[in-house]
Protein backbone atom coordinates (compact mmCIF):
# COMPACT_ATOMS: atom_id res chain seq x y z
CA UNK A 1 0.00 0.00 0.00
CA UNK A 2 1.23 3.48 -0.87
CA UNK A 3 0.92 5.85 2.10
CA UNK A 4 -1.40 8.79 1.47
CA UNK A 5 0.56 12.00 0.95
CA UNK A 6 -0.79 15.43 1.85
CA UNK A 7 -0.72 18.18 -0.79
CA UNK A 8 2.43 19.75 0.65
CA UNK A 9 4.27 16.40 0.79
CA UNK A 10 3.15 15.63 -2.79
CA UNK A 11 4.50 18.99 -3.98
CA UNK A 12 7.77 18.57 -2.09
CA UNK A 13 8.38 15.03 -3.38
CA UNK A 14 8.62 16.31 -6.99
CA UNK A 15 11.69 18.38 -6.06
CA UNK A 16 15.07 17.06 -4.88
CA UNK A 17 15.79 16.96 -1.15
CA UNK A 18 16.25 20.39 0.38
CA UNK A 19 13.97 22.03 -2.20
CA UNK A 20 10.23 22.60 -2.52
CA UNK A 21 7.86 23.37 -5.40
CA UNK A 22 7.08 27.02 -5.98
CA UNK A 23 3.39 27.43 -5.00
CA UNK A 24 2.54 29.50 -8.11
CA UNK A 25 4.75 27.69 -10.63
CA UNK A 26 5.16 23.94 -10.32
CA UNK A 27 8.08 23.88 -12.75
CA UNK A 28 10.27 25.76 -10.27
CA UNK A 29 12.02 24.13 -7.29
CA UNK A 30 13.09 26.62 -4.62
CA UNK A 31 15.70 25.97 -1.93
CA UNK A 32 14.20 25.50 1.53
CA UNK A 33 15.13 27.86 4.36
CA UNK A 34 17.70 26.79 6.96
CA UNK A 35 16.62 26.10 10.53
CA UNK A 36 16.41 29.35 12.47
CA UNK A 37 14.87 31.09 9.45
CA UNK A 38 11.49 31.20 7.71
CA UNK A 39 10.21 31.84 4.18
CA UNK A 40 9.73 35.52 3.45
CA UNK A 41 9.47 35.23 -0.35
CA UNK A 42 9.65 32.25 -2.72
CA UNK A 43 12.54 32.16 -5.19
CA UNK A 44 11.68 34.21 -8.32
CA UNK A 45 12.99 31.56 -10.73
CA UNK A 46 15.13 28.42 -11.17
CA UNK A 47 18.58 28.71 -9.59
CA UNK A 48 17.63 31.95 -7.84
CA UNK A 49 17.73 32.41 -4.07
CA UNK A 50 14.76 31.92 -1.77
CA UNK A 51 14.28 34.96 0.47
CA UNK A 52 14.63 33.58 4.01
CA UNK A 53 14.61 35.76 7.13
CA UNK A 54 15.82 34.96 10.63
CA UNK A 55 13.19 34.15 13.25
CA UNK A 56 12.41 36.96 15.62
CA UNK A 57 12.94 36.71 19.35
CA UNK A 58 10.40 34.35 20.95
CA UNK A 59 10.13 32.17 17.85
CA UNK A 60 12.09 29.38 16.17
CA UNK A 61 12.30 26.78 13.38
CA UNK A 62 14.12 23.57 14.28
CA UNK A 63 14.61 22.16 10.78
CA UNK A 64 14.85 23.28 7.15
CA UNK A 65 11.46 24.54 6.08
CA UNK A 66 9.32 26.75 3.88
CA UNK A 67 7.08 28.05 6.66
CA UNK A 68 5.62 31.52 6.30
CA UNK A 69 6.02 32.12 10.04
CA UNK A 70 8.37 30.83 12.71
CA UNK A 71 6.87 28.75 15.52
CA UNK A 72 6.25 30.35 18.90
CA UNK A 73 8.62 29.28 21.67
CA UNK A 74 7.08 27.04 24.32
CA UNK A 75 6.83 28.32 27.88
CA UNK A 76 7.55 26.06 30.82
CA UNK A 77 4.44 25.63 32.95
CA UNK A 78 5.25 26.80 36.47
CA UNK A 79 1.93 25.53 37.83
CA UNK A 80 3.02 22.02 36.79
CA UNK A 81 6.35 22.39 38.60
CA UNK A 82 8.27 22.67 35.33
CA UNK A 83 11.63 24.44 35.14
CA UNK A 84 13.52 25.70 32.10
CA UNK A 85 16.43 23.43 31.18
CA UNK A 86 17.48 25.50 28.16
CA UNK A 87 15.98 28.64 26.73
CA UNK A 88 14.55 29.05 23.26
CA UNK A 89 16.92 30.00 20.42
CA UNK A 90 16.07 30.75 16.78
CA UNK A 91 16.70 27.09 15.89
CA UNK A 92 15.58 25.25 19.01
CA UNK A 93 12.47 25.35 21.19
CA UNK A 94 12.59 25.84 24.95
CA UNK A 95 13.43 22.64 26.81
CA UNK A 96 11.44 22.16 30.02
CA UNK A 97 12.07 19.60 32.73
CA UNK A 98 11.82 18.90 36.45
CA UNK A 99 14.03 19.63 39.45
CA UNK A 100 16.43 17.12 41.00
CA UNK A 101 14.71 14.17 42.72
CA UNK A 102 11.56 14.69 40.68
CA UNK A 103 10.10 12.83 37.71
CA UNK A 104 7.78 13.76 34.85
CA UNK A 105 4.29 12.37 34.67
CA UNK A 106 2.71 12.86 31.26
CA UNK A 107 -1.01 13.59 31.51
CA UNK A 108 -1.09 13.82 27.72
CA UNK A 109 1.40 13.84 24.86
CA UNK A 110 2.23 17.52 25.36
CA UNK A 111 1.57 18.05 29.06
CA UNK A 112 3.67 16.80 31.94
CA UNK A 113 3.72 17.53 35.65
CA UNK A 114 6.67 17.22 38.01
CA UNK A 115 6.29 15.09 41.14
CA UNK A 116 8.73 14.20 43.90
CA UNK A 117 10.36 10.79 43.62
CA UNK A 118 9.13 8.35 46.27
CA UNK A 119 11.64 7.58 49.03
CA UNK A 120 10.27 4.08 49.79
CA UNK A 121 10.01 4.62 53.57
CA UNK A 122 9.04 1.29 55.22
CA UNK A 123 10.22 -0.46 52.05
CA UNK A 124 13.12 -0.84 49.67
CA UNK A 125 13.88 0.70 46.28
CA UNK A 126 13.16 -1.88 43.61
CA UNK A 127 13.81 0.51 40.69
CA UNK A 128 15.36 3.95 41.05
CA UNK A 129 13.50 7.08 40.06
CA UNK A 130 13.92 7.91 36.35
CA UNK A 131 13.29 11.03 34.29
CA UNK A 132 9.78 9.84 33.34
CA UNK A 133 9.03 7.24 36.02
CA UNK A 134 8.70 7.29 39.79
CA UNK A 135 10.73 5.03 42.07
CA UNK A 136 9.33 1.51 42.24
CA UNK A 137 9.08 0.45 45.88
CA UNK A 138 8.81 -2.97 47.51
CA UNK A 139 7.20 -2.73 50.94
CA UNK A 140 8.44 -4.46 54.10
CA UNK A 141 6.26 -7.12 55.74
CA UNK A 142 3.30 -5.53 57.50
CA UNK A 143 3.07 -2.76 54.91
CA UNK A 144 1.28 -2.42 51.56
CA UNK A 145 1.72 -0.09 48.60
CA UNK A 146 -0.85 2.69 48.26
CA UNK A 147 -0.26 5.62 45.91
CA UNK A 148 3.40 4.51 45.78
CA UNK A 149 3.88 4.78 49.54
CA UNK A 150 4.30 1.91 51.97
CA UNK A 151 1.37 2.11 54.37
CA UNK A 152 0.91 0.07 57.54
CA UNK A 153 -1.43 -2.92 57.23
CA UNK A 154 -3.33 -1.53 60.21
CA UNK A 155 -4.78 0.95 57.65
CA UNK A 156 -6.00 -1.88 55.41
CA UNK A 157 -9.76 -2.08 55.14
CA UNK A 158 -11.32 -5.41 54.14
CA UNK A 159 -12.79 -3.99 50.93
CA UNK A 160 -9.43 -2.80 49.62
CA UNK A 161 -6.94 -4.61 47.37
CA UNK A 162 -4.45 -4.70 50.26
CA UNK A 163 -6.30 -7.57 51.96
CA UNK A 164 -4.26 -10.16 50.01
CA UNK A 165 -0.97 -8.57 51.03
CA UNK A 166 -2.04 -7.96 54.60
CA UNK A 167 -4.00 -11.20 55.13
CA UNK A 168 -2.00 -12.47 58.15
CA UNK A 169 -2.29 -9.09 59.89
CA UNK A 170 -6.03 -8.88 59.16
CA UNK A 171 -6.54 -12.38 60.56
CA UNK A 172 -4.61 -11.39 63.68
CA UNK A 173 -6.69 -8.27 64.16
CA UNK A 174 -9.89 -10.26 63.57
CA UNK A 175 -8.72 -12.94 66.02
CA UNK A 176 -8.02 -10.33 68.68
CA UNK A 177 -11.43 -8.71 68.16
CA UNK A 178 -13.26 -12.06 68.30
CA UNK A 179 -11.55 -13.24 71.49
CA UNK A 180 -13.77 -11.13 73.73
CA UNK A 181 -15.46 -12.81 76.73
CA UNK A 182 -19.05 -13.92 76.32
Amino acid sequence: LVPHLGDREKRDSVCPQGKYIHPQNNSICCTKCHKGTYLYNDCPGPGQDTDCRECESGSFTASENHLRHCLSCSKCRKEMGQVEISSCTVDRDTVCGCRKNQYRHYWSENLFQCFNCSLCLNGTVHLSCQEKQNTVCTCHAGFFLRENECVSCSNCKKSLECTKLCLPQIENVKGTEDSGTT
Epitope: K75, K78, E79, M80, H105, F115, N134, E147, N148
Partner: nanobody
Framework: EVRLLESGGGLVQPEGSLRLSCAAS????????MVWVRQAPGKGLEWVSH????????FYADSVKGRFTISRDNSKNTLYLQMNSLRAEDTAVYYC????????????RGQGTLVTVSS
Protein backbone atom coordinates in the same frame (compact mmCIF):
# COMPACT_ATOMS: atom_id res chain seq x y z
CA GLU B 1 -13.84 19.31 53.73
CA VAL B 2 -13.17 19.83 50.02
CA ARG B 3 -16.33 19.79 47.90
CA LEU B 4 -16.60 20.13 44.11
CA LEU B 5 -19.98 20.05 42.42
CA GLU B 6 -20.29 20.04 38.63
CA SER B 7 -23.43 21.08 36.75
CA GLY B 8 -24.52 22.04 33.24
CA GLY B 9 -24.23 18.71 31.46
CA GLY B 10 -26.95 17.30 29.21
CA LEU B 11 -27.89 16.17 25.74
CA VAL B 12 -26.81 18.45 22.92
CA GLN B 13 -26.73 18.17 19.13
CA PRO B 14 -23.45 18.13 17.16
CA GLU B 15 -22.09 21.66 16.66
CA GLY B 16 -24.09 22.76 19.72
CA SER B 17 -22.81 24.45 22.89
CA LEU B 18 -22.87 23.84 26.64
CA ARG B 19 -21.43 25.63 29.64
CA LEU B 20 -20.30 23.52 32.57
CA SER B 21 -19.89 24.97 36.06
CA CYS B 22 -18.07 23.68 39.11
CA ALA B 23 -18.90 25.10 42.53
CA ALA B 24 -16.01 24.70 44.97
CA SER B 25 -15.83 24.90 48.76
CA UNK B 26 -13.68 23.77 51.68
CA UNK B 27 -10.38 25.23 50.41
CA UNK B 28 -8.89 28.52 49.21
CA UNK B 29 -10.11 28.38 45.62
CA UNK B 30 -8.18 31.48 44.53
CA UNK B 31 -4.85 29.77 45.37
CA UNK B 32 -5.39 26.55 43.41
CA UNK B 33 -4.88 25.49 39.80
CA MET B 34 -8.15 23.93 38.68
CA VAL B 35 -8.59 21.15 36.13
CA TRP B 36 -11.28 19.73 33.85
CA VAL B 37 -10.88 16.05 32.94
CA ARG B 38 -13.31 13.74 31.15
CA GLN B 39 -14.01 10.05 30.84
CA ALA B 40 -15.68 8.71 27.70
CA PRO B 41 -17.60 5.43 27.96
CA GLY B 42 -15.14 2.55 28.29
CA LYS B 43 -12.11 4.88 28.17
CA GLY B 44 -9.59 6.24 30.66
CA LEU B 45 -9.45 9.72 32.15
CA GLU B 46 -8.47 12.44 29.65
CA TRP B 47 -7.03 15.81 30.63
CA VAL B 48 -9.17 18.48 28.96
CA SER B 49 -7.97 21.81 30.32
CA HIS B 50 -6.53 23.54 33.36
CA UNK B 51 -6.32 27.11 34.58
CA UNK B 52 -3.81 28.59 37.07
CA UNK B 53 -5.02 30.76 39.99
CA UNK B 54 -4.40 34.01 38.09
CA UNK B 55 -6.13 32.67 34.93
CA UNK B 56 -2.98 33.34 32.89
CA UNK B 57 -2.06 30.95 30.06
CA UNK B 58 -4.65 28.19 30.48
CA PHE B 59 -3.85 24.82 28.93
CA TYR B 60 -6.06 22.97 26.42
CA ALA B 61 -5.75 19.45 25.05
CA ASP B 62 -5.28 19.44 21.27
CA SER B 63 -8.64 17.68 20.90
CA VAL B 64 -10.54 20.70 22.33
CA LYS B 65 -8.29 23.63 21.41
CA GLY B 66 -10.20 26.44 19.71
CA ARG B 67 -13.58 24.99 20.75
CA PHE B 68 -13.48 24.95 24.56
CA THR B 69 -12.74 27.86 26.91
CA ILE B 70 -11.88 27.43 30.58
CA SER B 71 -12.47 30.31 32.99
CA ARG B 72 -12.90 30.94 36.69
CA ASP B 73 -14.50 33.46 39.02
CA ASN B 74 -12.44 33.54 42.21
CA SER B 75 -15.00 35.77 43.92
CA LYS B 76 -17.67 33.08 43.40
CA ASN B 77 -15.38 30.04 43.93
CA THR B 78 -16.57 28.73 40.58
CA LEU B 79 -14.82 27.11 37.62
CA TYR B 80 -16.37 27.09 34.12
CA LEU B 81 -15.94 25.24 30.84
CA GLN B 82 -17.57 26.79 27.78
CA MET B 83 -17.88 24.07 25.12
CA ASN B 84 -18.66 25.09 21.53
CA SER B 85 -18.80 23.17 18.23
CA LEU B 86 -19.43 19.96 20.15
CA ARG B 87 -18.74 16.62 18.48
CA ALA B 88 -19.87 13.05 19.16
CA GLU B 89 -16.37 12.29 20.49
CA ASP B 90 -16.85 14.91 23.25
CA THR B 91 -19.46 12.61 24.84
CA ALA B 92 -18.14 11.84 28.33
CA VAL B 93 -18.55 12.44 32.03
CA TYR B 94 -16.78 15.73 32.82
CA TYR B 95 -15.10 16.19 36.20
CA CYS B 96 -13.55 19.23 37.78
CA UNK B 97 -10.67 18.73 40.16
CA UNK B 98 -7.81 20.32 42.04
CA UNK B 99 -4.44 19.99 40.36
CA UNK B 100 -2.80 16.92 41.95
CA UNK B 101 0.14 17.69 44.24
CA UNK B 102 1.34 14.43 45.82
CA UNK B 103 1.29 12.20 42.76
CA UNK B 104 -0.47 11.46 39.48
CA UNK B 105 -3.93 10.84 40.89
CA UNK B 106 -6.82 13.06 41.89
CA UNK B 107 -7.20 13.45 45.64
CA UNK B 108 -10.03 15.87 45.03
CA ARG B 109 -12.47 15.80 42.14
CA GLY B 110 -16.23 16.10 41.80
CA GLN B 111 -18.86 13.46 41.02
CA GLY B 112 -19.01 14.56 37.38
CA THR B 113 -21.65 15.75 34.93
CA LEU B 114 -22.60 13.78 31.81
CA VAL B 115 -22.34 15.46 28.41
CA THR B 116 -23.95 13.56 25.50
CA VAL B 117 -23.48 14.84 21.96
CA SER B 118 -25.93 13.16 19.61
CA SER B 119 -28.43 14.02 16.90
Amino acid sequence: EVRLLESGGGLVQPEGSLRLSCAASGFTFAHETMVWVRQAPGKGLEWVSHIPPDSQDPFYADSVKGRFTISRDNSKNTLYLQMNSLRAEDTAVYYCGLLPKRGPWFDYRGQGTLVTVSS
